[in-house]
């Protein structure tokens, strides 16, 4: 059975929008009027992971690209990276772990963990036009929760 | 080798609450997730629900409202808590061990407890 | 939920017989679908996983096949200690669920 996916694009609680920054590379910046066409759009599929009554296991792959948010160690920290894949084998149900993230809904916001990497986040920082990344706290200076905007395909 | 062993009391009360433990050898449950599994006598299985390696447990919709799963990682001890029973939930009751191989068989149940009845009477 | 339907709900069969079993899901689930033998005041062993992997230690003659919603479990040649219940199980989802089970009596 094809994996269910959605369209969506993410803005972070600072209505931040996400961007591509070079090929493998996300940023987050405010977005306005026309501009806001450069934002990703992501193609979030529901896959196996483990799941909890209250986080639903996801891969974040961008929309008609072949490129999927992914966690991996580097340096021996948890990081967050866009990886290549092969179009013809994904999206898939069964992911591999390092693609997987837990989507929680808080409050009307979402937050994504790695499920690789309990406790890490995707995450944005105050300042704008930084990258996106893989942060280990929630509820300090950097931005943890997320706004989804649905696309239609 | 994996083993999983059930142990609790075998009467409760209407209107108690259900308490047994699964203490697990043979693995980590850091690492595996187990399942809570139930049979009525005579009848078929019924899945309760889960604690995954991280703590993160999913309860099945019926139940939902009166159970808890935790676990002591420690000890190597899962416990399940269902309040408010009646008799509709007598059942031999069996804790498994979920394969948890990522990207491959995340959510069958391979190793099983030999299971212990409860049955709720007054 | 995903819904299970097995059939028979009962079957007799004598020793030497080959003997089906059929789970139908009420979704495509690929191939996550296991089968397990449960006999009487023990456990359900796991003897089949992804439809058709034959777990360690279980003997041939037990085979598993399909793929989306219509499964099959076959035993090639009954033996007097493959009389027990058999249940299918779909590991596609959470929640899990289980078919009604079929008893395979001697005849």
């Known amino acids: 059975a094809p994996v269910r996916s959605l369209n969506c694009t993410l803005r972070d609680s600072q209505q931040k929008s996400l961007v591509m920054s070079g090929p493998y590379e996300l940023k987050a910046l405010h977005l306005q009027g026309q501009d806001m066409e450069q934002q990703v759009v992501f193609s979030m599929s529901f896959v196996q992971g483990e799941e909890s009554n209250d986080k639903i296991p996801v891969a974040l792959g961008l929309k008609e690209k072949n490129l999927y948010l992914s966690c991996v160690l580097k340096d021996d920290k948890p990081t967050l990276q866009l990886e290549s894949v092969d179009p013809k084998n994904y999206p898939k149900k069964k992911m591999e772990k390092r693609f997987v993230f837990n989507k929680i809904e808080i409050n009307n916001k979402l937050e994504f963990e790695s499920a690789q990497f309990p406790n890490w986040y995707i995450s944005t920082s105050q300042a704008e036009n930084m990258p996106v990344f893989l942060g280990g706290t929630k509820g300090g200076q950097d931005i943890t929760d997320f706004t989804m905007q649905f696309v239609s395909s | 080798e994996v083993q999983l062993q059930e142990s609790g009391p075998g009467l409760v009360k209407p209107s108690e609450t259900l308490s047994l433990t699964c203490t697990v050898s043979g693995f980590s449950l850091s690492d595996y997730g187990v399942s809570w599994i139930r049979q009525p006598p005579g009848k078929g299985l019924e899945w309760i629900g889960l604690?995954?390696?991280?703590?993160?447990?999913y309860y099945n919709s019926p139940l939902k409202s009166r159970l808890t799963i935790s676990k002591d990682n420690s000890k190597s001890q899962v416990s399940l808590k269902l309040s408010s029973v009646t008799a509709a939930d007598t059942a031999v009751y069996y804790c498994?061990?979920?394969?948890?191989?990522?990207?491959?068989?995340?959510?069958?149940?391979?190793?099983w407890g030999q299971g212990t009845l409860v049955t709720v009477s007054s | 939920d995903i819904q299970m339907t097995q059939s028979p709900s009962s079957l007799s069969a004598s020793v030497g017989d080959r003997v089906t079993i059929t789970c139908q899901t009420s979704?495509?689930?690929?191939?996550?679908l296991n089968w397990y033998q449960q006999k009487p005041g023990k456990a359900p062993k796991l003897l089949i996983s992804l439809a058709s992997t034959l777990r360690p230690g279980v003997p041939s003659r037990f085979s598993g096949s399909g793929s989306g919603t219509d499964f099959t479990f076959t035993i090639s040649s009954l033996q007097p200690e493959d009389f027990a219940t058999y249940y299918c199980?779909?590991?596609?989802?959470?929640?899990?669920?289980f078919g009604q089970g079929t008893k395979l009596e001697i005849k």
């Open positions: 498994a061990k979920q394969t948890n191989i990522w990207a491959y068989d995340l959510y069958s149940m391979d190793y």
């Open positions: 979704t495509d689930i690929d191939d996550d």
């Open positions: 199980l779909q590991s596609d989802r959470l929640p899990l669920t």
């Open positions: 604690i995954w390696g991280s703590g993160d447990t």
